[in-house]
């Protein structure tokens, strides 16, 4: 999905109002410095692409993030403010259901959510100096 035509201001507002709090709750008891940055993004559409990938694509180390509250709210936000997003997700959801569930390593999920927080922070930040 191409996130270029999303309403970034609305997505940012949703993130600050709800999604961020759920991510921080998930990470409670963990310092942000416990994990180094292993993923980045270079503009708002790119950030949303990487956020979607980390949130909804199961990995061998962390298979279950899509069921978390922050993931559900992320999905709802993208469906609301990115034209045509929900249609593109129907096939992806059906494909996901066919995958076998793997055992989750909690620490690896914490690491993945830490990366998600970093991506969201890049998405909402007012940029560096422009010279």
């Amino acid at each position: 999905y191409d996130f270029t035509n999303c309403d970034f201001q609305k997505i940012e507002a949703d993130y600050l109002r709800t999604i961020s709090k759920d991510l921080i709750t998930y990470m409670s008891g963990t310092k942000s410095t416990d994990f180094n940055n292993t993923v980045s993004c270079s503009n708002r559409p790119h950030c949303l692409t990487e956020i979607q990938s980390l949130t909804f694509n199961p990995t061998p180390r962390c298979a279950s993030l899509a069921k978390e509250m922050f993931a559900r709210k992320t999905k709802a936000t993208l469906a609301l403010w990115c034209p045509g997003y929900s249609e593109t997700q129907i096939n992806a959801t059906q494909a996901m259901k066919k995958r076998r569930k793997r055992k989750v390593t909690t620490n690896k999920c914490l690491e993945q959510v830490s990366q998600l927080l970093g991506l969201w922070r890049r998405f909402i930040r007012t940029l560096l100096k422009k010279q």
């Epitope: 940055n37 993923v39 270079s42 940029l127 422009k130 010279q131």
Partner: antibody
Framework: QMQLVESGGGVVQPGRSLRLSCAAS????????MHWVRQAPGKGLEWVAV????????HYADSVKGRFTITRDNSKNTLNLQMNSLRAEDTAVYYC???????????????WGQGTMVTVSS | SYVLTQPPSVSVAPGQTARITCGGN??????VHWYQQKPGQAPVLVVY???DRPSWIPERFSGSNSGNTATLTISRGEAGDEADYYC???????????FGGGTKLTVL
């Protein structure tokens, strides 16, 4: 852990070519801008080239423009530097480094490789 | 192209504060990054975006940037801080990375 490992250095005669590689691991390579930086013996750091996270755009230092080519393969997590028409002044340790980018701004180089030595001598 | 100027060397007594400067035209409008390099090793990022510090760098390292000068401050200097320090910016107007010439820090 996050790692960059350079290879391909060696001794080469002036006018000849050499290809350096940098293998990335432990992070999502395709989301970072990647640089080559060199350091001549006893001298300071000199930036050589950068390639955008997507490979769409490339920038070179004037000293290597037209002779060096930076490329990346995001499917293999590798960065390359093809060096042609080598000169004695290209003798240096060559480092690859990663940097987050935002739009057309490259941020700090937060991970560096250990370097590979290139000696241009007849 | 853009030029960054650093003093070739700076000395500090153990436990004292070292300040390494980096000069450039209107440097305060650029984001300045600082690297530490010990002999035979690769550079290590110690301060980015003028004053931010990677999680693995001690709080003794700090940075500031305004006007035409950026400063890397190392408080309570230790023997292990002896190294070359480089400032760096991304020059958007020319799409080039620019490094300062480097400063050798000696802990007396």
């Amino acid at each position: 852990q996050m790692q960059l490992v350079e290879s391909g250095g060696g001794v080469v005669q002036p006018g000849r070519s050499l290809r350096l590689s940098c293998a990335a691991s432990g992070f999502t390579f395709r989301t970072y801008g990647m640089h080559w930086v060199r350091q001549a013996p006893g001298k300071g750091l000199e930036w050589v080239a950068v390639i955008w996270y997507s490979g769409a755009y490339i920038h070179y230092a004037d000293s290597v423009k037209g002779r060096f080519t930076i490329t990346r393969d995001n499917s293999k997590n590798t960065l390359n530097l093809q060096m042609n028409s080598l000169r004695a002044e290209d003798t240096a340790v060559y480092y690859c480094s990663r940097s987050p980018q935002w739009e057309d701004i490259f941020e700090a180089m937060d991970i560096w490789g250990q370097g590979t030595m290139v000696t241009v001598s007849s | 192209s853009y030029v960054l100027t650093q003093p070739p060397s700076v000395s500090v007594a153990p436990g004292q504060t070292a300040r390494i400067t980096c000069g450039g035209n209107n440097l305060g409008s650029y984001s300045v990054h600082w690297y530490q390099q010990k002999p035979g090793q690769a550079p290590v990022l110690v301060v980015y975006d003028d004053s931010d510090r990677p999680s693995w760098i001690p709080e003794r390292f700090s940075g500031s940037n305004s006007g035409n000068t950026a400063t890397l401050t190392i408080s309570r200097g230790e023997a292990g801080d002896e190294a070359d320090y480089y400032c760096q910016v991304w020059d958007m107007s020319s799409s080039l990375v620019v490094f300062g010439g480097g400063t050798k820090l000696t802990v007396l």
